[in-house]
């Protein structure tokens, strides 16, 4: 058993049929010695008396808010949550495995640039009695500060018969050094509490590996005189790190015909303009990636040819 | 470069960009393992990193690029030695067309561009880990290449910025 925060305790349980559970001793936070009784949640049933209460925690029915009373007045509370371990593996019932980029990916994180700011998100099908808290640091043995904001419900989607909820959090490294080569990874820890179930999820990454630029902006097409070709140009997204002579992007461009089946030639360039043949009803698209490190490509930015 | 002269920024830019491409060909991002979850931390902790105080940021390069260039050169020599060691020559066997061979040569080429004959900056001691098992060797190979990808990315940014803003 360990303290999650004041008056909230997590009991770690090996979860299998007929498991013996954990013996837990609760102590009433009071100078009083006599006449103390204990109850669980809203039930008025007295579980025991005395300054301490010893319970065997085996299942969710044994978890909840234990209160010690004297003369009808509550003296202190202890909320017991359960953290299940099945076959040596902590339970992951609350969050959905996103399976990208690999199995057992519960938290996904992205950064738009090298400023030390990043966003993490996760998915669940649970809609009520759910709370999250997030901590982050750079490195674990001698951690450097990362400040995270409040967790927000960022999207709701219908998947078949189920509703899926996406939660996200934004974090900022306190003393980011965008030009340096990261040596220690960022650690993100998410505590999830659903009713009386506690789970924790972690992710470890370098900012360089989670970079995904915003799409290029200001796509423009300029037809060339007496030619089927057009001059296309675009700009670095506003959110990308500066100066661009240092934090350079590379681009992938393509012209996509009306039909999705039509063969599309992709061209790679470090420039912010190109000459392409852009037929009527087709569209021109461009995406960006860090020029020197193969992290994610941005989403496509597109503009119709006509 | 030693003694304050400027490097051939444009040449360094080209070669460092080639290094980036080769480093990713030698070890593309594959989902087979999270290398940070494995052991062998000590060897890759010894590799030189370009850190915040090394003057490799745009402002630091404008003030005095020498600190940064020296750091980059140290790293290039370090990785060049590692890529020539039995970590890469032992099993699992690399074919002669492996990008590791070109990577090795390009690291040497860029470090020489930064230090013409006759100049000798002190370089740090190169560790000589010699894991005997193919498993340990391969793991170390992957870690070194992942670490090299990060190192050459910073070096390439430095030379691109230098070529754009510091070339005479």
């Amino acid at each position: 058993i360990w303290e999650l925060k004041k008056d909230v305790y997590v009991v770690e349980l090996d979860w299998y049929p007929d498991a013996p559970g954990e013996m837990v001793v609760l102590t009433c936070d009071t100078p009083e010695e006599d006449g103390i009784t204990w109850t669980l949640d809203q039930s008025g049933e007295v579980l025991g008396s005395g300054k301490t209460l010893t319970i065997q925690v085996k299942e969710f029915g044994d978890a909840g808010q234990y209160t010690c009373h004297k003369g009808g007045e509550a003296l202190s509370h202890s909320l017991l949550l359960l953290h299940k371990k099945e076959d040596g593996i902590w339970s992951t019932d609350v969050l959905k495995d996103q399976k990208e980029p690999k199995n057992k990916t519960f938290l996904r994180c992205e950064a738009k640039n090298y400023s030390g700011r990043f966003t993490c998100w996760w998915l669940t099908t649970i809609s009520t009695d759910l709370t999250f808290s997030v901590k982050s640091s750079r490195g674990s043995s001698n951690p450097q500060g990362v400040t995270c904001g409040a967790v927000t419900l960022s999207a709701e989607r219908v998947r078949g018969d189920n509703k899926e909820y996406e939660y996200s959090v934004e974090c900022q490294e306190d003393s980011a050094c965008p030009a340096a080569e990261e040596r220690l990874p960022i650690e993100v820890m998410v505590d999830a509490i659903h009713k009386l179930k506690y789970e924790n999820y972690t992710s470890s990454f370098f900012i360089r590996d989670i970079i995904k630029p915003d799409p290029p902006k200001n796509l423009q097409l300029k037809p060339l005189k007496n030619s089927r070709q057009v001059e296309v140009s675009w700009e670095y997204p506003d959110t990308w790190s500066t100066p661009h002579s240092y934090f350079s992007l590379t681009f992938c461009i393509q012209v996509q015909g009306k039909s999705k089946r039509e063969k599309k030639d992709r061209i790679f360039t470090d420039k912010t303009s190109a000459t392409v043949i852009c037929r009527k009803n087709a569209s021109f698209s461009v995406q960006a990636q860090d020029r020197y490190y193969s992290s994610s490509w941005s989403e496509w930015a597109s503009v119709p040819c006509s | 470069v030693p003694g304050g002269s400027s490097p051939a920024w444009a040449q360094c830019q080209q070669l460092s960009q080639k290094l980036c491409t080769l480093a990713w060909s030698a070890h593309p991002l594959v989902g087979h393992m999270d290398l940070r979850e494995e052991g062998d931390e000590e060897t890759t902790n010894d590799v030189p990193h370009i850190q915040c105080g090394d003057g490799c940021d745009p402002q630091g390069l404008r003030d005095n690029s020498q600190f940064c260039l020296q750091r980059i050169r140290q790293g290039l020599i370090f990785y060049e030695k590692l890529l020539g060691s039995d970590i890469f020559t032992g099993e699992p066997s690399l074919l002669p067309d492996s990008p590791v061979g070109q990577l090795h040569a390009s690291l040497l080429g860029l470090s020489q561009l930064l230090q013409p004959e006759g100049h000798h900056w002190e370089t740090q001691q190169i560790p000589s880990p010699s894991p005997s098992q193919p498993w340990q060797r391969l793991l170390l190979r992957f870690k070194i290449l992942r670490s090299l990808q990060a190192f050459v990315a910073v070096a390439a940014r430095v030379f691109a910025h230098g070529a754009a803003t510091l070339s005479p």
Partner: antibody
Framework: QVQLVQSGAEVKKPGSSVKVSCKAS????????IHWMRQAPGQGLEWIGY????????KYNENFKGKVTITADKSTSTAYMELSSLRSEDTAVYYC?????????????WGQGTLVTVSS | DIQMTQSPSSLSASVGDRVTITCKAS??????VAWYQQKPGKVPKLLIY???TRHTGVPSRFSGSGSRTDFTLTISSLQPEDVADYFC?????????FGSGTKLEIK
């Protein structure tokens, strides 16, 4: 896209020789090793060896040394595998293949195979 | 030479079954193991490399695992089109060697 096209089936007498070709296209021929494998009827695969066209250096499986000669012609982007002193045990489908670009020998592209039958 | 001992040599399973093929290397090959599928009369097709990395376009029902000497190819839910021979292959040490193959049939 990368293609490897092999020469047609051959029927040979014991003691004779055969030369199988593998014409490569869709990539720079001198950039990658070309490997040869064989598969006897109903059997598994055996790695014979490779040629690196950039420097014309072959490497052989010791079990095939003296039996096989692997060469390459850069002008036609073609690799060849010659088998000498043929015996009935050499009856097999012979494949050429090229590996992944990262320098490890897992094989992504294969020729269609050439059946060599040795029979008197 | 490194021997790759593959088992079973043949197996028959029903559509939807989970199928497992194993390969044992005679010495440490790290994770330098690939798996190929070969349909009758066709060329071998790469499924898995580095013991567990799926090649582009290979269905997610195919997965690989293992390291050093013990390797497994798993088909999580057998489909009719999976009828084929399957080979493991070590590329750690010269000469590169292959398992003897597993013939997979549908019941």
């Amino acid at each position: 896209q990368v293609q490897l096209v092999q020469s047609g089936a051959e029927v040979k007498k014991p003691g004779s020789s055969v030369k199988v070709s593998c014409k490569a296209s869709g990539y720079t021929f001198t950039d990658q090793t070309i490997h040869w494998m064989r598969q006897a009827p109903g059997q598994g695969l055996e790695w014979i060896g490779y040629i690196y066209p950039r420097d014309d250096s072959p490497k052989y499986n010791e079990n095939f040394k003296g039996k096989v000669t692997i060469t390459a012609d850069k002008s036609t982007s073609t690799a060849y595998m010659e088998l000498s002193s043929l015996r009935s045990e050499d009856t097999a489908v012979y494949y050429c293949a090229i590996p992944d670009r990262s320098g490890y020998a897992w094989f992504i592209y294969w020729g269609q195979g050439t059946l060599v039958t040795v029979s008197s | 030479d490194i021997q790759m001992t593959q088992s079973p040599s043949s197996l028959s399973a029903s559509v939807g079954d989970r199928v497992t093929i194993t390969c044992k290397a005679s010495r440490d090959v790290a994770i330098a193991v690939a798996w190929y599928q070969q349909k009758p009369g066709k060329v071998p097709k790469l499924l898995i490399y580095w013991a567990s990395t799926r090649h582009t376009g290979v269905p997610s029902r195919f997965s690989g695992s293992g390291s050093r000497t013990d390797f497994t190819l798993t088909i999580s839910s057998l489909q009719p089109e999976d009828v084929a021979d399957y080979f493991c292959h070590q590329y750690s040490s010269y000469p590169f060697t292959f398992g003897s193959g597993t013939k997979l049939e549908i019941k």
